[in-house]
Amino acid sequence: APPPINKLALFPDKSAWCEAKNITQIVGHSGCEAKSIQNRACLGQCFSYSVPNTFPQSTESLVHCDSCMPAQSMWEIVTLECPGHEEVPRVDKLVEKIVHCSCQACGKEPSHEGL
Amino acid sequence: APPPINKLALFPDKSAWCEAKNITQIVGHSGCEAKSIQNRACLGQCFSYSVPNTFPQSTESLVHCDSCMPAQSMWEIVTLECPGHEEVPRVDKLVEKIVHCSCQACGKEPSHEGL
């Protein structure tokens, strides 16, 4: 995929932006007490463009799409208490913790911390 | 797919934008004379966001991506002359003529009007 576009010559005053916003995430499970955790969500306006196709195609289709998504994240365990469930007094949920975000090719998905 | 987002409560000063820009498009084919035609390209900054996943998943994955793409286009025939090609003296190329553009769900295929 081509690298993300941050500036366009046609619109010199416009810039792509993609931020990791602090959020309070509610982690829940049926029959358990939900927990609020601090996390981050990615939010932004990346560039996209579409140049008309021809058929038969002369060149590669000139369509570009960037999307604001996690550039780095990791999974953490969040334990929920489940009162009244003697057999399952607690449930462990896995939560993706987003570290930071960037404009990336729309087909590409977010990355997770190294092995 | 959810409707495109034009405004975000978190960023009241930001607006999605997606324009149809006039361009001169070169339509070519190997061994034929290229033609210049007037066309339009879509260009813009639509909103996208990504909210962290959980496992087991509690809700649908909260990922949204809009992309600037043709909202209306049609295909036109452009005939190219191919001198020195007695067997194929001309070639008909189909060219997508973009009418207007809008922010639409990234996975969506652009809509085309018939010939």
């Epitope: 996690p70 994240s73 990791m74 999974w75 365990i77 399952v88 462990d92 896995l94 993706e96 590409k108 998905e109 977010p110 990355s111 997770h112 911390e113 190294g114 092995l115 | 996943n53 496992f55 994955s61 990922v63």
Partner: antibody, heavy 118, light 112 residues
Framework: QVQLVQSGAEVKKPGASVKVSCKAS????????MHWVRQAPGQGLEWMGI????????SYAQKFQGRVTMTRDTSTSTVYMELSSLRSEDTAVYYC???????????WGQGTLVTVSS | DVVMTQSPLSLPVTPGEPASISCRSS???????????LDWYLQKPGQSPQLLIY???NRASGVPDRFSGSGSGTDFSLKIRRVEAEDVGVYYC?????????FGQGTKLEIK
């Protein structure tokens, strides 16, 4: 829905290499690591290694070190496992399985039978 | 490498009766964060394995509540409250504390 679709069965000669693919769909490809696990006929499960599809970093079981290579193509959401210098003991069904981070293997491919025979 | 040992290797059960499988690890799977890095999988005949239990005691999505996982450190067990015909297959424990991840030899559950 989440799907891991693996390439078809292969028959190889001893000493050759095999490359098995695993195409992911229905989820955010790089939000989940991918494991490779194999199972010889009538035997148990054997863990081969893991790849992080985002950066491409890998960790292999010592037993396969130097013979196995795991790669990924984010543009097609596909992970590959290549095993070289094949011997008859490598005859097995090879599975890819995704995992949230380094946690459990929650979805598995349908498996690819690799037969090594002269 | 962490060695995982399951018992019994074969388990004939009458439908409606309980069943229990044991899994022992050669070193503790209890991490400093308080979680046991032990999962259970079921491989039904002719199918790919499926996740039953993760982190020692958590049922995966869609797993019937007759399945439960327990234990800590080096001793773990999988219990089926009332065995049903659809539960036949080979059960595996697997540790994800450290690489290489390792599986138990498998326990074959069959209906009497």
């Amino acid at each position: 829905q989440v799907q891991l679709v693996q390439s078809g069965a292969e028959v190889k000669k001893p000493g050759a290499s095999v490359k098995v693919s695993c195409k992911a769909s229905g989820y955010t490809f790089t939000s989940y690591y991918m494991h490779w696990v194999r199972q010889a006929p009538g035997q148990g499960l054997e863990w081969m290694g893991i790849i992080n599809p985002s950066g491409g970093s890998t960790s292999y079981a010592q037993k396969f070190q130097g013979r196995v290579t795991m790669t990924r193509d984010t543009s097609t959401s596909t992970v590959y496992m290549e095993l070289s210098s094949l011997r008859s003991e490598d005859t097995a069904v090879y599975y890819c399985a995704r995992a949230p981070g380094k946690f459990p293997l929650d979805y598995w491919g349908q498996g690819t039978l690799v037969t090594v025979s002269s | 490498d962490v060695v995982m040992t399951q018992s019994p290797l074969s388990l004939p059960v009458t439908p409606g009766e309980p069943a229990s499988i044991s899994c022992r690890s050669s070193q503790s799977l209890l991490k400093s964060n308080g979680y046991n890095y032990l999962d259970w999988y079921l491989q039904k005949p002719g199918q790919s394995p499926q996740l039953l239990i993760y982190l020692g005691s958590n049922r995966a999505s869609g797993v019937p509540d007759r399945f439960s996982g327990s234990g800590s450190g080096t001793d773990f067990s999988l219990k089926i409250r009332r065995v049903e015909a659809e539960d036949v297959g080979v059960y595996y424990c697997m540790q994800t504390l450290q690489t290489p991840y390792t599986f138990g030899q498998g326990t074959k559950l069959e209906i009497k």
